[in-house]
Interface confidence: medium
């Protein structure tokens, strides 16, 4: 009766479906209401529908599949999960969905899931089992390789009293589930700290995005075993300084490339060995560009063109001589 | 030729509930979606519900989301629409229609309509 | 939801004359891909018929006088020569997301 549009790739029908009469057996494969599908690109896209859960009725040769821009809240346990399994779901994307929850097993019965976006939603209760699926201490191999994790802070209003550093912290590190993990991204979601264990537990790191966040200091983080780490960006923190064990652990890595504009970078005694260190080292990208914000006297000095009597620090005066 | 035909309707009080049917025929009635949609005396249409072709997806209105339920029964090649605890504005002329496989092209056969009436 | 806001609400044609209908959604109802918008035709005493489906595709067996296009929130139902078959009520209808929701209807009637 509707002819399919030759169109595009992206259909919502198909050519075997176009007459009214059809001889075709039940489809298992249908394109769900309020999405698009393309068998060829194997993607479904379901964006900007307001949709508040996940369809039920995804077609079993889904690789991508975008969910982006609804309504969805809260991904339950099983979220995904089909009889037959969507056993080739390679991509999901989710974000941008009004999401506050995902609960402990949300991507479990995805055997072949390797990439997961979730930026861009409000989450206020991560399970810390959402991307393990389970709370024993060691789970089975997550397939996940690339986590982007933008955007996810909450208003602070709807924040639980806990750390939301530690209830990311915790879903990443849950049952070492994450060992295959290649691509995390946590840009954007206000950290004030970085726990100190989490990195050592995602050995397989090849790039990490703590963009855009307000980390102080680098202090108790340690680098070492992220051997295969090659992006670091930390633009857009609060870093005043780096010290010498994370310049000695960065220095140590071998395809490392860092990323450190728009730091408030503080030029005074302290900062001479990481000066010293710019000034050498190969790994910082755009390391021309970074410039000293405190103290006054040497605000958007570049760090490159400091020497050793540029970097005093005031004398502490005495209690005595203090003044109020 | 693709044919709906809705029944089911009659005169009821408010609160009491009734169950409208369509048979389907001339297509295979397992690969395709089917809405309900009504239109009240001398009003324009309003979309009432969708049932995918598995039964696996329901999407209703908020105005009936509660009391009324579709469902399917592809054996059959029927569609039913149970409604619980009417009221006087479902008073309205019921039509199945068939979204044609995949749901981007509208609705693109009809029933000719099932009259309710909701009255004391 | 999405309002589907129709003009004009009525409509008198000299037979053999051109008639446009709009309809304008509160917000898009179009992906990259394709446009969920579509028309139908109403007579008196009958159901709805599908005229026009993703905006501008011809149902199979409408007369070729009847056009659609648009994207976005703008569409148009165009009927190039009127005739008198045409009397009826015409609505458009979204289905972008749920609930579908229908124009108000735009009344056809002949001069």
């Known amino acids: 009766s509707s002819p399919t549009s030759s169109a595009s790739s992206f259909s919502s029908s198909a050519p075997f479906l176009a007459s009214a009469v059809s001889a075709q057996p039940p489809l298992p494969d249908q394109c769900p209401a309020l999405c698009e599908c393309s068998e060829a690109a194997r993607t479904v896209k379901c964006v900007n529908r307001n949709l508040t859960e996940v369809p039920t009725d995804l077609p079993a040769y889904v690789r991508n599949l975008f969910l982006t821009g609804n309504q969805l809240a809260v991904l339950p346990a099983g979220a995904f999960a089909r009889r037959p399994p969507l056993a080739e779901l390679a991509a999901l994307n989710l974000s941008g969905s009004r999401l506050d929850e995902v609960r402990a097993g949300a991507f479990e019965h995805l055997p072949s899931l390797r990439q997961l976006d979730l930026s861009h939603n409000p989450l206020a209760d991560l399970s810390p089992f959402a991307f393990s699926g389970s709370n024993a201490s060691v789970s089975a191999p997550s397939p996940l390789v690339e986590l982007i994790l933008n955007h996810i802070v909450p208003p602070e209003d709807e924040r639980q009293n806990r750390s939301f550093e530690g209830m990311v912290v915790a879903a990443l590190l849950a049952g070492r589930a994450l060992q295959g993990l290649r691509r995390l991204e946590l840009a954007s979601n206000h950290f004030l700290y970085l726990p100190r264990d989490v990195l050592a537990q995602l050995p397989s790191l090849r790039h990490l995005d703590l963009s855009n966040n307000s980390l102080v200091s680098l202090t108790y983080v340690s680098f070492r075993n992220l051997t295969h780490l090659e992006s670091l960006h930390l633009e857009d923190n609060a870093l005043k300084v780096l010290h010498n064990g994370t310049l000695a652990e960065l220095q140590g890595l071998p395809h490392i490339r860092v990323f450190l504009d728009n730091n408030p970078w503080v030029c005074d005694c302290h900062m001479a060995d990481m000066v010293t260190w710019l000034k050498e080292t190969e790994v910082v990208q755009g390391k021309d560009r970074l410039t000293c914000a405190y103290p006054e006297k040497m605000r958007n000095r570049v760090l490159l063109e400091l020497n050793s009597a540029d970097l005093d620090c005031d004398p502490i005066l005495p209690p005595s001589l203090q003044t109020s | 030729e693709v044919q709906l035909v809705e029944s089911g309707g009659g005169v009821v009080q408010p609160g009491r509930s009734l169950r409208l049917s369509c048979a389907a025929s001339g297509f295979t009635f397992s690969n395709f979606g089917m809405h309900w949609v009504r239109q009240a005396p001398g009003k324009g249409l309003e979309w009432v519900a969708y049932i995918s072709s598995g039964s696996s997806t329901f999407y209703y209105a908020d105005s009936v989301k509660g009391r009324f339920t579709i469902s399917r029964d592809n054996s059959k090649n029927t569609l039913y629409l149970q409604m619980n605890s009417l009221r006087a504005e479902d008073t309205a002329v019921y039509y199945c229609?068939?979204?044609?496989?995949?749901?981007?092209?509208?609705?693109?056969?009809w029933g000719q309509g099932t009259t309710v009436t909701v009255s004391s | 939801d999405i309002v589907m806001t129709q003009t004009p609400l009525s409509l008198s044609v000299t037979p053999g004359q051109p008639a446009s209908i709009s309809c304008r959604a509160s917000q898009s109802v179009s992906s990259s891909t394709f446009s969920y918008m579509h028309w139908y035709q109403q007579k008196p005493g009958q159901p709805p018929q599908l005229l026009i489906y993703s905006s501008s595709n011809l149902e199979s067996g409408v007369p070729d006088r009847f056009s659609g296009s648009g994207s976005g929130t703008d569409f148009t139902l165009k009927i190039s020569r009127v005739e008198a078959e045409d009397v009826g009520v015409y609505y458009c209808q979204h289905s972008w997301e749920i609930p579908y929701t229908f124009g108000g209807g735009t009344k056809v009637e002949i001069k």
């Open positions: 229609a068939r979204s044609p496989a995949y749901y981007r092209y509208g609705l693109d056969y």
